[in-house]
């Protein structure tokens, strides 16, 4: 059985303030069952950016339909970027449970925010 991998192909992404940023992420397997979550930063101080199954994340849109069977694309688009959004974003696979258990993280994508062109 092939080990699950979480792939974030871009090491860095740069966008202008006010624009949208696309952060790409794919998984190599649908197994085990469980959600993907996106975080900014690592460790206990990390910020939850998007949870596939719960919560309301108004600036975040999944690029692919998360309800589609066999979907392994967990890329997201964050709208209306501000300087406070700068940082490294991690796509993290969890195993379903109570609570969910963190299984595997992508390598991270650094988002840098350029000043809005005047």
């Amino acid at each position: 059985e092939e080990e699950l991998q979480v792939i974030q192909p871009e090491k860095s992404v740069s966008v202008a303030a006010g624009e949208s940023a696309t952060l790409n992420c794919t998984a190599t397997s649908l197994i085990p069952v469980g959600p993907i979550q996106w975080f900014r930063g690592v460790g206990p101080g990390r910020e939850l950016i998007y949870h596939q199954k719960e919560g309301h994340f108004p600036r975040v849109t999944p690029v692919s339909d998360p309800t589609k069977r066999n979907n392994m694309d967990f890329s997201i688009r964050i709208s209306n970027i501000t300087p406070a959004d700068a940082g490294t974003y991690y796509c993290v696979k969890f195993r379903k449970g109570s609570p969910d258990v963190e299984l595997k993280s992508g390598a991270g994508t650094e988002l840098s925010v350029r000043a809005k062109p005047s």
Epitope: G18, G41, P44, E47, I49, H56, F57
Partner: antibody, heavy 119, light 108 residues
Framework: DVQLVESGGGVVRPGESLRLSCAAS????????MNWVRQAPGEGLEWVSR????????DYADSVKGRFTISRDNSKNTLYLQMNSLRAEDTAVYYC????????????WGLGALVTVSS | ETVLTQSPATLSVSPGERATLSCRAS??????LAWHQQKPGQAPRLLIY???NRATGIPDRFSGSGSGTDFTLTISSPQTEDSAVYYC??????????FGGGTKVEIK
């Protein structure tokens, strides 16, 4: 309906401690950053502290840094503010406020808890 | 650190007479500005976010405009229940989150 209800306010002497609680309901508490904002009598709003959704990331206003500690218990849907070494200038109504998303405005406010520091 | 300056400090208008409140930021905050209403003895309530979007349940007599450093909250036809203090809040740069000093609106 989102509800935020503060408790734990009261009258204390300078140098004493107090712990405020904010009970949250009507939303997925563990998914949202939360804040404390205070308002001294007859004054405007002053942001005090923020905690991220998981509880491991905190920020403080310079005026309370080192004296106040924000925390949360996601299993109890409750936000806390531990206030130590209280000063007269900490007298205020303390509001808990939910963030719309992690990097955003405050979309819901509690009713507030009055803290009075007086000798 | 971004400073928000609100003017005027007090605004007295008659019912039905347009009220215009200003909030100026010391540096650009893009469109990341919210307005909150606080009636006497009550908690603040979100009115407008992202400079111009009305929050859920807010009457359409309230509108927001502006971007960058200059923002306006307009109450097109104020009612007596609109007597309150109005605060702007920026969330472009943080921490700290900053509020303006407030504008007190009195309906004559």
């Amino acid at each position: 309906d989102v509800q935020l209800v503060e408790s734990g306010g009261g009258v204390v002497r300078p140098g004493e401690s107090l712990r405020l609680s904010c009970a949250a309901s009507g939303f997925s508490f563990r998914s949202y950053a939360m804040n404390w904002v205070r308002q001294a009598p007859g004054e405007g709003l002053e942001w005090v502290s923020r905690i991220n959704s998981g509880g491991g990331g905190t920020d403080y206003a310079d005026s309370v840094k080192g004296r106040f500690t924000i925390s949360r218990d996601n299993s109890k849907n409750t936000l806390y503010l531990q206030m130590n070494s209280l000063r007269a200038e900490d007298t205020a109504v303390y509001y808990c406020a939910k963030q719309y998303d992690w990097n955003s405005f405050f979309d819901y406010w509690g009713l507030g808890a009055l803290v009075t520091v007086s000798s | 650190e971004t400073v928000l300056t609100q003017s005027p400090a007090t605004l007295s208008v008659s019912p039905g007479e347009r009220a215009t409140l200003s909030c100026r930021a010391s540096q650009t905050v893009g469109s990341k500005l919210a307005w909150h209403q606080q009636k006497p003895g009550q908690a603040p309530r979100l009115l407008i976010y992202d400079a111009s979007n009305r929050a859920t349940g807010i009457p359409d007599r309230f509108s927001g405009s502006g971007s960058g450093t200059d923002f306006t909250l307009t109450i097109s036809s104020p009612q007596t229940e609109d007597s309150a203090v109005y605060y702007c809040q920026q969330y472009y740069y943080w921490p700290p989150y900053r509020f303006g000093g407030g504008t007190k609106v009195e309906i004559k």
